[in-house]
């Protein structure tokens, strides 16, 4: 039962962290304007990983696309391949972790197949939180490097009285959703991996099955001792627990390849 | 088309307060600020702060921070600007003005304050 | 604030003529993110709210006609009239739309020749 609910949860868990994930990742407010120096402005900024946008005093925002993709920062492009990474390793890991659930019942698929898949989505899980953390992470590395580089030539057009203040950017909305969202599916992928091993035990040296000690078959008798013990061909046997364990260089790995957008 | 109607004139005394509406039509009231701008005779135009319907945020100009007061009714379109302690310096045309680089404007409403 | 000055006070110009109005901000205007200019003019007639004839500096208002041109950036700008018509006889406004409080110029009055 805890194994079940243990399994449930990290599924949740982790579809939230996904769903989040998407949301960052659509999100245009990535970056914000800083107001620190202009905090009466009527033009207000803020950028995505895929458009710009400016919200005017009318009230009216205008948002304009990233057209090109030569002319962008390499880190920007990394960014954006790490956070669909993640949601291509989350989605894929969401379809197996379906099928995975103790609580549905596919055909007649054992418990070590589903041990198996447990543990497969869950490693996916953990990587796409970690894809999602680390695109976030990078981009607010970013953006805090250009803000001190900027502060450092706050006024770059001192032309006699008049000046120009540089615009600076600080963390947006969708950084927050981005880490928490990452966070969960990377919570969610341990809570799948923790379900797995209570679905399958790891196996010990020596094969389990199961003793069948029938009082018809065993004979005391003075003199001696005969047993049957019915060890002969155990292809009737049935394990206790079906062996979900799988040695390390089994669990098969996705290369985190993705072709740019 | 987008249309921005006003209510009528009013005369007040000094010290009281004048509450002027402006109804929006044409468009999605919840979408655009609506700015309040003033004129006095003869002069030029004076901005006085603007509502945003969407979300009943506001932003005065500091000039008229303590006496102006913007509302907003979304079920009926419409914005409120309250001026209290009328001065006679305060008789204006006040206009309410929306859209893009102030688009469109209402007729404008006359406040005259005399004693 | 900034302070938005606008000169010439007053204007003749005659029917047919170039007229030019400058507008002079004491901040620049200029927004790095979509590197546009937040300037806007208007005309305003005798007993009419004021009608806009260009936003963000250069670009004019639907139904405003081709003659009417804005120019500029940064503090300095310019409403450029190429032909003077009979109907433009105005009083024309700059405004800040950058930063709060939205401030006007004291407006120029453009009178035919």
């Known amino acids: 039962m805890a194994v079940t609910a243990c399994q449930g949860l990290g599924f949740v868990v982790s579809l939230i962290g996904i769903a989040g994930i998407i949301a960052a990742t659509c999100m245009d407010q990535w970056s914000t304007q800083d107001l620190y120096n202009n905090p009466v402005t009527a033009v207000f900024n803020y950028q995505g990983l895929w458009r710009s946008c400016v919200r005017e005093s009318s009230g009216f925002t205008e948002c304009r696309g990233y057209f090109t993709l030569l002319g962008l920062p390499a880190m920007l492009q990394a960014v954006r391949a790490l956070m669909i990474v993640g949601i291509v390793l989350g989605a894929i890991g969401l379809l197996v972790s379906i099928f995975a659930l103790k609580c549905i019942r596919i055909g007649s698929m054992e418990d070590s197949a589903k041990a198996n898949m447990t543990l497969t989505s869950g490693i996916m899980f953990i990587v796409s939180g970690l894809c999602a953390i680390a695109g976030v992470s990078v981009f607010a590395n970013m953006l805090v490097t250009n803000f001190w580089m900027s502060t450092a030539n706050m006024y770059t057009g001192m032309g006699g009285m008049v000046q120009t203040v540089q615009t600076r950017y600080t963390f947006g909305a969708a950084l927050f959703v981005g880490w928490v969202a990452g966070g969960l599916t990377l919570i969610g992928g341990v809570m799948m991996c923790i379900a797995c091993r209570g679905l399958a035990p790891e196996e010990t040296n020596y094969k389990a099955v199961s003793y069948h000690a029938s009082g018809h078959s065993v004979a005391y008798k003075p003199g001696g001792f005969k047993a049957s013990t019915g060890f002969g061909s155990n292809t009737k046997n049935k394990k206790i627990y079906d062996g979900g364990a799988r040695t390390e260089d089994e669990v098969q790995s996705y290369p985190s390849k993705h072709d740019y957008v | 088309q987008v249309q921005l109607v006003q209510s009528g004139a009013e005369v007040k005394k000094p010290g009281a307060s004048v509450k002027v509406s402006c109804k929006a039509s044409?468009?999605?009231?919840?979408?655009?600020?609506i700015h309040w701008v003033r004129q006095a005779p003869g002069q030029g135009l004076e901005w006085i702060g603007y509502?945003?319907?969407?979300?009943?945020?506001?932003n005065y100009n500091l000039k008229f921070k303590d006496r102006a007061t913007m509302t907003s009714d979304t079920s009926i379109s419409t914005a409120y600007m309250e001026l209290s302690r009328l001065r006679s310096d305060d008789t204006a045309v006040y206009f309410c003005?929306?859209?893009?680089?102030?688009?469109?404007w209402g007729q404008g409403t006359l406040v005259t304050v005399s004693s | 604030d900034i302070v938005m000055t606008q000169s010439p006070d007053s204007l003749a110009v005659s029917l047919g003529e170039r007229a030019t109005i400058n507008c002079k901000s004491s901040?620049?205007?200029?927004?790095?993110?979509?590197?546009?200019?937040?300037l806007i003019w208007y005309q305003q007639k005798p007993g009419q709210p004021p009608k806009l004839l260009i936003y963000?500096?250069?670009t004019r208002d639907s139904g405003v006609p081709d003659r009417f041109s804005g120019s500029g950036s940064g503090t300095d700008f310019t409403l450029t009239i190429s032909s003077l018509q009979a109907e433009d006889v105005a009083v024309y406004y700059c405004?800040?739309?950058?930063?709060?409080?939205?401030?006007f110029g004291g407006g120029t009055k453009l009178e035919i020749k």
């Open positions: 003005a929306t859209g893009r680089g102030f688009a469109y």
């Open positions: 963000r500096a250069s």
């Open positions: 405004q800040n739309d950058y930063s709060y409080p939205l401030t």
């Open positions: 509502i945003s319907p969407g979300n009943g945020g506001s």
């Open positions: 044409g468009f999605t009231f919840t979408s655009y600020n």
């Open positions: 901040q620049s205007l200029f927004n790095s993110g979509n590197q546009k200019n937040y």
